[in-house]
């Protein structure tokens, strides 16, 4: 039999944050290899990961391709040293991954603050727009792209003194919030999509950045502007 | 020959975060998983968790609410935090590489490559 | 959760004697994930044997490995003095992971 000691794959699991998607199973082979495939309901079986002896599968490829098309995968299992035979027609086993529709069930990644300013008693807070791996016309979009205005940020801010915090919501990336003269802020994010009603609706909040922490540093994500 | 050097904090509060990395010199993250072990004063080995080079992970569900393990391939490290922790987390937090070795036509797995080891206090 | 149980707890020997050490796991463990390790005090755990049976690279041909299914034993032919230790056996299958309680080898 060409699939001797082979044994079906199980737990298979997707693990997706902002589109990046990785399909996880178990066990790890011993007397195997692993090929998957994946399909949306009406589509072909697309192969991947062929032969590995990984127990996981990266299909960002596939799934950006229609983020609102539900996906179907499985795991074959091959005997360790398999070379695919041409007259074997015995289906290797293989197991079905439940299905997955990224824009409905995608993570959302922890937000970062890419600027703030003070202007009188104004605070302008800028979310930082990360990037996907969708693409539109050969151009990758960020998240508030493909999202649009099902995407949300909340901002938590307080002042440094006290724990009493306050609440904005915004559904560009931006915030104009109100603040007291002479006294300094902090502030955390969190992305929401309103419209699920799923754990995973919201992101964990973002690094907490304070106002009056003369970094004096140029970050990667952006300045820091702190007009006083 | 592949070295692990870890690093990261001693000395923790109660309900703070432990954080630990480990580097990799003399290797590749690809084609092995890296695990968190720990060891409580006079205690045996308990495991954490353990990641693969593409970020998937696997951990142990009496920790698994409190743990995340990142990898970073552009630094060749990974990394441990554990949430909220109580005197019960004091203990020694070694790295070590999970190695798949393939030999006439089935995988073995060990793990061959260890950290030093960090001590972790929690106390108040 | 696979759980190892390792015996006896302490093995006091001389150097120059045969140690056999047992670990038993609560359901059967394939022997590709099974493995044991050697630490010392102050130091890491070392890699002795893998898939039960085989020896780590640099591992003294008086280490030996065995078993399958649900019992194992590590042997030390002829224990030299740097092989007084604490011995772990740990199975890599079955998540969580896990290592047995160990077997503390000690000059007699």
């Known amino acids: 039999s060409g699939t001797t000691n082979t044994v079906a794959a199980y737990n298979l699991t997707w693990k997706s944050t902002n589109f990046k998607t990785i399909l996880e199973w178990e066990p790890k082979p011993i007397n195997q290899v692993y090929t998957v495939q994946i399909s949306t309901k009406s589509g072909d079986w697309k192969s991947k990961c062929f032969y590995t002896a990984d127990t996981e599968c990266d299909l960002t490829d596939e799934i950006v391709k229609d983020v609102k098309q539900t996906y179907l995968a499985r795991v074959f299992s091959y005997p360790a040293g398999h070379v695919e035979s041409t007259g074997s027609t015995e289906e290797p086993p293989y197991e079905n991954s439940p299905e997955f529709t990224p824009y409905l069930e995608t993570n959302l990644g922890q937000p970062t603050i890419q600027s703030f300013e003070q202007v009188g008693t104004k605070v302008n807070v800028t979310v930082q727009d990360e990037w996907t791996l969708v693409r539109r016309n050969d151009t990758f979009l960020s998240l508030r792209d493909v999202f649009g205005k099902d995407l949300i940020y909340t901002l938590y801010y307080w002042k440094s003194s006290s724990s009493g915090k306050k609440t904005a919501k915004t559904n560009t990336n931006e915030f104009l919030i109100d603040v007291d003269k002479g006294e300094n802020y902090c502030f955390s994010v969190q992305a929401v999509i309103p419209s699920r009603r799923t754990a995973n609706r919201k992101s964990t909040d973002s690094p907490v950045e304070c106002m009056g922490h003369e970094k004096g540093e140029s970050r990667e994500t952006g300045h820091h502007h702190h007009h006083h | 020959q592949v070295q692990l050097q870890q690093w990261g904090a001693g000395l923790l509060k109660p309900s703070e975060t432990l954080s630990l990395t480990c580097a990799v010199y003399?290797?590749?993250?690809?084609?092995?998983?890296w695990s968190w072990i720990r060891q409580p004063p006079g205690k045996g080995l308990e495991w954490i968790g353990e990641i693969g080079a593409s970020g998937s992970t696997r951990y142990n569900p009496s920790l698994k609410s409190r743990v995340t393990i990142s990898v970073d391939t552009s630094k060749n490290q990974f990394s441990l935090k554990l949430s909220s922790v109580t005197a019960a987390d004091t203990a020694v937090y070694y790295c070590a590489r999970d190695t798949p070795y393939y030999y006439e036509g089935g995988y073995y797995y060990y793990m061959d490559v260890w950290g030093k080891g960090t001590t972790v206090t929690v106390s108040s | 959760e696979i759980v190892l149980t390792q015996s006896p707890g302490t093995l006091s020997l001389s150097p120059g004697e045969r140690a056999t050490l047992s670990c038993r796991a609560s359901q059967s463990v394939s022997s590709s994930y099974l493995a044991w390790y050697q630490q010392k005090p102050g130091q890491a755990p070392r890699l002795l044997i893998y898939?039960?049976?085989s020896r780590a690279t640099g591992i003294p041909d008086r280490f030996s490995g065995s078993g399958s299914g649900t019992d194992f034993t590590l042997t030390i032919s002829r224990l030299e003095p740097e092989d007084f230790a604490v011995y772990y056996c740990q199975q890599v299958g079955v998540v969580p992971y896990t290592f047995g309680g160990g077997t503390k080898v000690e000059i007699k």
């Open positions: 898939g039960a049976s």
């Open positions: 003399g290797g590749s993250l690809s084609g092995y998983y």
